[in-house]
């Protein structure tokens, strides 16, 4: 229950990629504003996005403090221009979010192939180690820093003249694969966290092909 001119938020949804984390909800406000609170299971509530007319709140700064914690958020509804007003129970109307554990649930962002280099019949493909917003000692950690060996990359590679995708895997950011001499290959990578049960894969990187700028060819 609440005052007659406010409605509770609904469809509270976490949107998170590489730990950049936003809470979204409905409805678009009509004569009301929202405030968000976030807490760990055992922690105190912290207020964010005070009296906003937005239907999203960036909670990245809070969740990156400990990405392995489980977080809960709630969205309070207040009448516009009368934010002291409360519901009939003496509290503003609010709705709880689902629980969210960033380490287990943040989506893996689209990776990027940084470079590839052919030496004879070997190609070394390097994946960019994307920076996250997770900090340690005042420096931003990379995806590899955060996930360590939990993160692997799958490389799809194929002859430009063919459609079948061979695969290779690495728990570093580098692949060394065998290729046929004189053939041009294309590459795409996918980030994977095999230990997860959901959100295990990223979208595929843009395809990069030999004979384009990113690569280097050396005949031995």
């Amino acid at each position: 229950s609440g005052t007659t001119n406010t409605v509770a938020a609904y469809n509270l949804t976490w949107k998170s990629t590489n730990f950049k984390t936003i809470l979204e909800w409905e409805p678009k406000p009509v004569n009301q504003v929202y405030t968000v609170q976030i807490s760990t299971k055992s922690g105190d509530w912290k207020s964010k996005c005070f009296y906003t007319t937005d239907t999203e709140c960036d909670l990245t700064d809070e969740i990156v403090k400990d990405v392995k914690q489980t977080y809960l958020a709630r969205v309070f509804s207040y009448p516009a221009g009368n934010v002291e007003s409360t519901g009939s129970a003496g509290e503003p109307l609010y709705e709880n979010s689902p629980e969210f554990t960033p380490y287990l649930e943040t989506n893996l962002g689209q990776p990027t192939i940084q470079s590839f280099e052919q030496v004879g019949t070997k190609v070394n493909v390097t994946v960019e180690d994307e920076r996250t917003l997770v900090r340690r000692n005042n420096t931003f950690l990379s995806l590899r820093d955060v996930f360590g060996k939990d993160l692997i990359y799958t490389l799809y590679y194929w002859k430009s003249s063919s459609s079948g995708k061979k695969t290779a895997k690495t728990n570093t950011n580098e692949f060394l694969i065998d290729v046929d001499k004189g053939e041009n290959y294309c590459f795409s990578v996918q980030a994977v966290i095999p230990s997860r049960t959901v959100n295990r894969k990223s979208t595929d990187s843009p395809v990069e092909c030999m004979g384009q700028e990113k690569g280097e060819f050396r005949e031995i």
Epitope: Y156, Q190, P194
Partner: antibody
Framework: EVQLVESGGGLVQPGGSLRLSCAAS????????IHWVRQAPGKGLEWVGY????????YYADSVKGRFTISADTSKNTAYLQMNSLRAEDTAVYYC?????????????WGQGTLVTVSS | DIQMTQSPSSLSASVGDRVTITCRAS??????VAWYQQKPGKAPKLLIY???FLYSGVPSRFSGSRSGTDFTLTISSLQPEDFATYYC?????????FGQGTKVEIK
């Protein structure tokens, strides 16, 4: 519980076609990779091909390339093996299997298999 | 393609025996080798992954090891339910390939 159930096997004439289905439950196929592996009567295991249902990427054994096509319908959580231009040597039990996708673990769950007999 | 040469193709053993099956890869496959057990009319079951790691629920009498491109499956004390066919498989490169299988029969 992870389960894979194949269906669609049967008797088909040489040159004919058949489509096998692999219905998955207990996991979402787009989060994994699906392989087809076959076993001719009294023989060993032969890998047929794989699909990454997330992006549709596939790869096939040379013995079936150009004749077999693997596809997936993520909304039905089901993978398929379309077999065309079938030959007597394609007679086998066909298994679909889940690839866990890590560096270490490869196929961790198998279906019960479905028998395909190619004979006139 | 990488060949996996498995030996022996069959062996006879008694309950309580120590049984060893080997697989040789035609080139380096790192530790990307799995071992499967298959009983007649049934699907294969994963026993060992990454050359030496016991899959969940598999009895500890099964073990795997690697020496270069040679891989070994050992059953320390054969039990009645272990009579089956065993396959090695490499998944280091595409296409993944299986060994020919080893049938373990009752002596």
């Amino acid at each position: 519980e992870v389960q894979l159930v194949e269906s669609g096997g049967g008797l088909v004439q040489p040159g004919g076609s058949l489509r096998l289905s692999c219905a998955a439950s207990g996991f979402t196929i787009s989060d994994y990779w699906i392989h087809w592996v076959r076993q001719a009567p009294g023989k060993g295991l032969e890998w047929v091909g794989y699909i990454d249902p997330y992006n549709g990427y596939t790869y096939y054994a040379d013995s079936v390339k150009g004749r077999f096509t693997i596809s997936a319908d993520t909304s039905k959580n089901t993978a398929y093996l379309q077999m065309n231009s079938l030959r007597a040597e394609d007679t086998a039990v066909y298994y679909c299997a889940r690839d866990y996708g890590s560096l270490q673990v490869f196929i961790d769950h198998w279906g019960q298999g479905t028998l395909v007999t190619v004979s006139s | 393609d990488i060949q996996m040469t498995q030996s022996p193709s069959s062996l006879s053993a008694s309950v309580g025996d120590r049984v060893t099956i080997t697989c040789r890869a035609s080139q380096d496959v790192n530790t990307a080798v799995a071992w499967y057990q298959q009983k007649p009319g049934k699907a294969p079951k994963l026993l060992i992954y990454s050359a030496s790691f016991l899959y969940s629920g598999v009895p500890s009498r099964f073990s795997g090891s690697r020496s270069g491109t040679d891989f070994t499956l050992t059953i320390s004390s054969l039990q009645p339910e272990d009579f089956a066919t065993y396959y090695c498989q490499q998944h280091y490169t595409t296409p993944p390939t299986f060994g020919q299988g080893t049938k373990v029969e009752i002596k």
